[in-house]
């Protein structure tokens, strides 16, 4: 239905306090430079205003679009051009133009320094101080370096915070309390991050089709028991969701989640038996609850696969009378029968699916040369799974770092012209994995290893994006999204790079590297091994483990020597030496 | 909504000719092979020929090879038999299909071949 005042029918619905956030998290999510102060200033502004219209919908401006009013208000910041360059040339722009012209230069690697926790008792002061501009303080910090994090997830996560800061801060042990807890929700903050970027890349460069295909095929594993009407219908609704948050209408988005989330309680009869817990919770937890929500019990009388799509003499009929709407009937059965199969395996063997009725149903007898598409399928299934065998069985053989090495040399020598923080990034994520999936029942790794990479390969392809410099990386990231995992996987050396050449600082290093947290010792390590096979990019891996062993000892030794610097000056050279001749 | 209508059946002596077509609606017609199949009392149904997209390639059952002549006009969305010598086993009720299905799903068009 159409509202007099679109700001105040989203303040109505969402209540001040999340109205505020998501302002803020758009603030912050479009102007990435500007300080929590700057932002919330104009967030203030915004309320007052939206306060008004509350008040009196026929009040001056309150008529006009949310994009044309947070736009407005970004436009008339001073300093605009000093600080953002070509960003301000946006303001030129009518909507929808600028808005489009701010999303396009939402920048996925900020050049912002990392989010420092503060210590425990300094952060438990100024929450107990004003608990709200902390939060306000914890979303700006979040979303100018996520810009594209799920506005309403962060909210949850904001509230997470508040909760364990809440119970923490009047403990004695304030610190133990604080840091298993925080570091929990930034690294399940951190997945979410990549997994909505993924989400709004799909949305990006292959349309609403691509999402909704992705959310069929999610929501079938999850919901079995759903007929395809009910699965349709919440996938539409899932889209135009991530459409809205993806495209910046973060108020919108927030507020039809919140009606998904009513719409999936009211009706648990047709969805799920699982959802009943998740539906007895407050909103925020209420919408994140359900996004994780185990898969509900298969339906036990499952008829074959085949018999509506392989043997059944329509299937062509079918086919050409309402593509779509049959290719989503596909992949809604497969999924349903397969929760233990990643979504983007679900969606190749889709694809495939699609292609050889394509084929097929052009020939004179298609029936015959369709008849083996399933057994067609086999490689597809395999390749993910033998993935997941090989590179569990590496995780429970080197562990999370040993693991994240394997990965950092193994992407080194695929792409060596990327930027070593970018490779030990995409290597320290990627090695993650194994912990977070390795170490779940055999039937949940597939899904967890590849939905999980191909997130993270999405990150790759964004910052590559930014500094194209390796045709493998570029060839890989043209492609589909659901393609970009095999093909990454099945990259070898790079032949035509040219190798480094050896400098002795890359390698050299100092007593300031003995006092670092071991996160950032095992980055240093990190570096200097991807350094290592840029100038030697066929090593062997013992060759390689030779020197990291030959380093770690040394950084022992020198780190727990007397006098610290004049053991790393002096070591320090000889260390070198030994990396040349083990490498020559 | 996927639409076949044939065309051009009647009665005919044995050994005559007669040409059927098939007008298709509400799909790609130029994307999807074509089959004519036929039913007869007490037979049930049985696949005739078939043709590609293209209509680069086209089978025949062993009933009708050498007799029959399957073609289509994709410009026209259109499909053709052109039968030949014809027998009295040929009697039947004929439809086209879509993809080799042999499931008829228009009016059909009757042949009777007889003296």
């Known amino acids: 239905e159409a509202h007099k005042s679109e700001i105040a029918h989203r303040y109505n619905d969402l209540g001040e306090q999340h109205f505020k956030g998501l302002v803020l998290i758009a603030f912050s999510q479009y102007l990435q430079k500007c300080s929590y102060d700057e932002h919330a200033k104009l967030v203030q502004e915004v309320t007052d205003f939206a306060k008004t219209c509350v008040a009196d919908e026929s009040a001056a401006n309150c008529d006009k679009s949310l994009h044309t009013l947070f736009g407005d208000k970004l436009c008339a910041i001073p300093n605009l051009r000093e600080n953002y360059g070509e960003l301000a040339d946006c303001c030129t722009k009518q909507e929808p133009e600028r808005n489009e012209c701010f999303l396009q230069h939402k920048d996925d690697n900020p050049s912002l320094p990392p989010f420092e926790r503060p210590e425990a008792e300094a952060m438990c002061t100024s929450f107990k101080e004003n608990p709200t501009t902390f939060m306000g303080h914890y979303l700006h910090e979040v979303a100018r370096r996520h810009p594209y994090f799920y506005a309403p997830e962060l909210l949850y996560y904001a509230e997470q915070y508040n909760e364990i800061l809440t119970q923490c801060c009047a403990e004695a042990d304030k610190e133990s309390c604080l840091t298993p807890k925080l570091d929990g929700v930034k690294e399940k903050a951190l997945v979410s991050s990549v997994r909505q970027r993924m989400k709004c890349s799909s949305m990006q460069k292959f349309g609403e089709r691509a999402f909704k295909a992705w959310a069929v095929a999610r929501l079938s594993q999850t919901f079995p028991n759903a007929d395809f009407a009910e699965i349709t219908k919440l996938a539409t609704d899932l889209t135009k969701v991530n459409k809205e948050c993806c495209h910046g209408d973060l108020l919108e988005c927030a507020d039809d989640r919140a009606e998904l989330a009513k719409y999936m309680c009211e009706n648990q009869a047709t969805i799920s038996s699982k959802l009943q817990t998740c539906c007895d919770k407050p909103l925020l937890k209420k919408a994140h609850c359900l996004s994780e929500v185990e898969h509900d019990t298969m339906p036990a009388d499952l008829p074959a696969i085949a018999a509506d799509f392989v043997e059944d003499q329509e299937v062509c009929k079918n086919y050409a009378e309402a593509k779509d709407v049959f290719l989503g009937t596909f992949l809604y059965e497969y999924s349903r029968r397969h929760p233990d199969y990643s979504v983007s395996l679900l969606l190749r063997l889709a694809k495939k699916y699609e292609a050889t009725l394509e084929k097929c149903c052009a020939e004179a007898n298609p029936p015959a040369c369709y008849g083996t598409v399933l057994a067609e399928f086999q490689p597809l299934v395999e390749e993910p799974k033998n993935l997941v065998k090989t590179n569990c069985d590496l995780y429970e053989k080197l562990g999370e770092y040993g693991f994240q090495n394997a990965i950092l040399v193994r992407y080194t020598q695929k792409a060596p012209q990327v930027s070593t923080p970018t490779l030990v990034e995409a290597a320290r994520n990627l090695g993650r994995v194994g912990t977070k999936c390795c170490t779940l029942p055999e039937d949940q790794r597939l899904p967890c290893v590849e939905d999980y990479l191909s997130a993270i390969l999405n990150r790759v392809c964004l910052l590559h994006e930014k500094t194209p410099v390796s045709e493998h990386v570029t060839k890989c990231c043209s492609g589909s999204l659901v393609e970009r995992r095999p093909c990454f996987s099945a990259l070898t050396v790079d032949e035509t790079y040219v190798p480094k050449e050896f400098k002795a600082e890359t390698f050299t290093f100092h007593s300031d590297i003995c006092t670092l947290p071991e996160k950032e010792k095992q980055i240093k390590k990190q570096t200097a091994l991807a350094e290592l096979v840029k100038h030697k990019p066929k090593a062997t891996a013992e060759q390689l483990k030779t020197v990291m062993d030959d380093f770690a000892q040394f950084l022992d030794t020198c780190c727990k020597a007397a006098d610290k610097d004049t053991c790393f000056s002096t070591e320090g050279p000889n260390l070198v030496t030994r990396c040349k001749d083990a490498l020559a | 909504q996927v639409q076949l209508q044939e065309s051009g059946g009647g009665l005919v002596q044995p050994g005559g000719s007669l040409p059927l077509s098939c007008e298709a609606s509400?799909?790609?017609?130029?994307?999807?092979?074509m089959t004519w199949v036929r039913w007869a009392p007490g037979k049930g149904v049985e696949w005739v020929s078939g043709?590609?997209?293209?209509?680069?390639?086209?089978l025949y059952a062993d009933s009708v090879k050498g007799r029959f002549t399957i073609s289509r006009d994709n410009a026209k969305n259109t499909l053709y038999l052109q039968m030949n010598s014809l027998k009295p086993e040929d009697t039947a009720v004929y439809y086209c299909?879509?993809?080799?299905?042999?499931?008829?799903g228009g009016q059909g068009t009757q042949v009777t071949v007889s003296s």
């Open positions: 043709i590609s997209s293209l209509g680069d390639s086209t």
């Open positions: 299909t879509i993809g080799g299905s042999l499931n008829p």
């Open positions: 509400g799909f790609t017609f130029s994307r999807f092979g």
